[in-house]
């Protein structure tokens, strides 16, 4: 049967993003419509046809355009994605003979981790804090020269859609740690990044 091929995309916040649909059919469509999937009913964003060209709905005027003007292959581009743009989008190819044939492409917005790593001595112990803020939520691990060191982790969700994960390493005999390297590992979207800290006696 006739189908539409799409690909989901993951793009960084405040960068451009494109979604593409391809009608796997010998014939072009008469009109292509892009809609954003919403809880109640989909919202029309933009249409393209030979008769009327590109028609962008007012709510999307400065946000998107059709950057591949095809009736078989259609691409929409968001100029500067925000968290509100995350979601799934439907492309509808209205074809002669077979009606509306649709595909769905989903856009995920990510924010690269911002990491801070610092330590603090008190009289009998040392706290090393590693905090990572990202979208989706990052994971924080420790690489320390010896085992048996306790840590505690706190997760905080922010209104802007990012999540902070703060892990505190509790070292009971700080003298043994002086001059040694501690590594905080941040895992985000399948990539692990090492952040190194050498403890110096203040």
């Amino acid at each position: 049967q006739v189908q539409v091929v799409t690909q989901d995309e993951r793009e960084q916040l405040y960068t451009p993003a494109s979604l593409k649909c391809s009608l796997q059919n010998a014939q072009e469509a008469l009109i292509v419509t892009w809609q954003k999937k919403k809880a109640v009913s989909p919202e029309n964003m933009v249409t393209f046809s030979e008769n009327h060209g590109v028609v962008i709905q007012p709510a999307y005027k400065d946000k998107i355009n059709i950057t591949q003007l095809g009736l078989q292959n259609s691409t929409i581009t968001f100029w500067n994605i925000t968290l509100e743009d995350e979601g799934c989008y439907m492309c509808l190819f209205n074809t002669f003979g077979f009606g509306k044939i649709s595909g769905t492409a989903c856009l995920t917005v990510y924010v690269q981790p911002i990491v801070s790593l610092h330590y603090k001595f008190s009289e009998d112990h040392l706290n090393i804090t590693c905090s990572a803020t990202a979208r989706p939520a990052p994971m924080v691990f420790w690489k320390v020269p010896r085992s048996g060191i306790e840590n505690s982790t706190v997760t905080l969700s922010h209104p802007n859609g990012t999540t902070s994960v703060t892990s505190i390493l509790h070292i009971k005999d700080p003298k043994n740690q002086v001059g040694k390297e501690v590594i905080c590992q941040v895992l985000h979207l399948g990539t692990v990044t090492d952040f190194k800290q050498t403890v110096n006696k203040g």
Epitope: N25, A26, L30, T95, F98
Partner: antibody
Framework: QLVQSGAEVKKPGASVKVSCKAS????????ILWVRQAPGQRLEWMGH????????NYNLKFKGRVTITRDTSASTAYMELSSLRSEDTAVYYC??????????WGQGTLVTVSS | DIQMTQSPSSLSASVGDRVTITCKAS??????LSWFQQKPGKAPKSLIY???RLVDGVPSRFSGSGSGTDFTLTISSLQPEDMATYYC?????????FGQGTKLEIK
């Protein structure tokens, strides 16, 4: 461009299969459609097929009596109408379209249903 | 199904006349309408598609207009060879449906 099979006389309850042979173009690039015209009546859309995929769409008025198929190796489309009745007596035409642009038609096939 | 109603059912006009045939859809069909010419014993011939686009090779005296529910086929200067029956076809919604036809005769 589109050549249809010859006239047929059928008895009520029988089936008829009309062929439409395409030449001079890439068969899978155009939809093949079937319309019919009973004596003194308007044209009636029966259905169509996209030879590229073999996807077809039928007018539900025919209640499953019509089947449109294609043989890409022979560049031929077929329209079969079953459970024939006298009111199916008509000229059956195949045509081709690129989207909604209809350009070539077969010469028509007269199907007479009579006991 | 969408009903297509043509008017008039038949008309007689003289060579050189401007002739207008109308087609009314029972619901909005956008611009998804074609016009066909059919001569006795012959297959239909496409004249206009998408309401106002002329098919290649069709004389420029034929033109189409309209959108939504009301459509018009105009022959600007009638010629003897235009004697035929004219049909409109909607293809906005399946099943696609034809008008009942307008028989055009030359006076």
């Amino acid at each position: 461009q589109l050549v249809q099979s010859g006239a047929e006389v059928k008895k009520p309850g029988a089936s008829v299969k009309v062929s439409c042979k395409a030449s001079g173009y890439s068969f899978t690039d155009y939809i093949i459609l079937w319309v019919r015209q009973a004596p003194g009546q308007r044209l009636e859309w029966m259905g169509h097929i996209d030879p590229y995929y073999g996807s077809s769409n039928y007018n539900l008025k025919f209640k499953g009596r019509v089947t449109i198929t294609r043989d890409t190796s022979a560049s031929t489309a077929y329209m079969e109408l079953s459970s024939l009745r006298s009111e199916d007596t008509a000229v059956y035409y195949c045509g081709r379209s690129k989207r909604d642009y209809f350009d070539y038609w077969g010469q028509g096939t007269l199907v007479t249903v009579s006991s | 199904d969408i009903q297509m109603t043509q008017s008039p059912s038949s008309l007689s006009a003289s060579v050189g006349d401007r002739v207008t045939i109308t087609c009314k859809a029972s619901q909005d069909i956008n611009s998804y309408l074609s016009w066909f010419q059919q001569k006795p014993g012959k297959a239909p011939k496409s004249l206009i598609y998408r309401a106002n686009r002329l098919v290649d090779g069709v004389p420029s005296r034929f033109s189409g207009s309209g959108s939504g529910t009301d459509f018009t086929l105009t022959i600007s200067s009638l010629q003897p060879e235009d004697m035929a029956t004219y049909y409109c076809l909607q293809y906005d919604e399946f099943p696609y449906t034809f008008g009942q036809g307008t028989k055009l005769e030359i006076k």
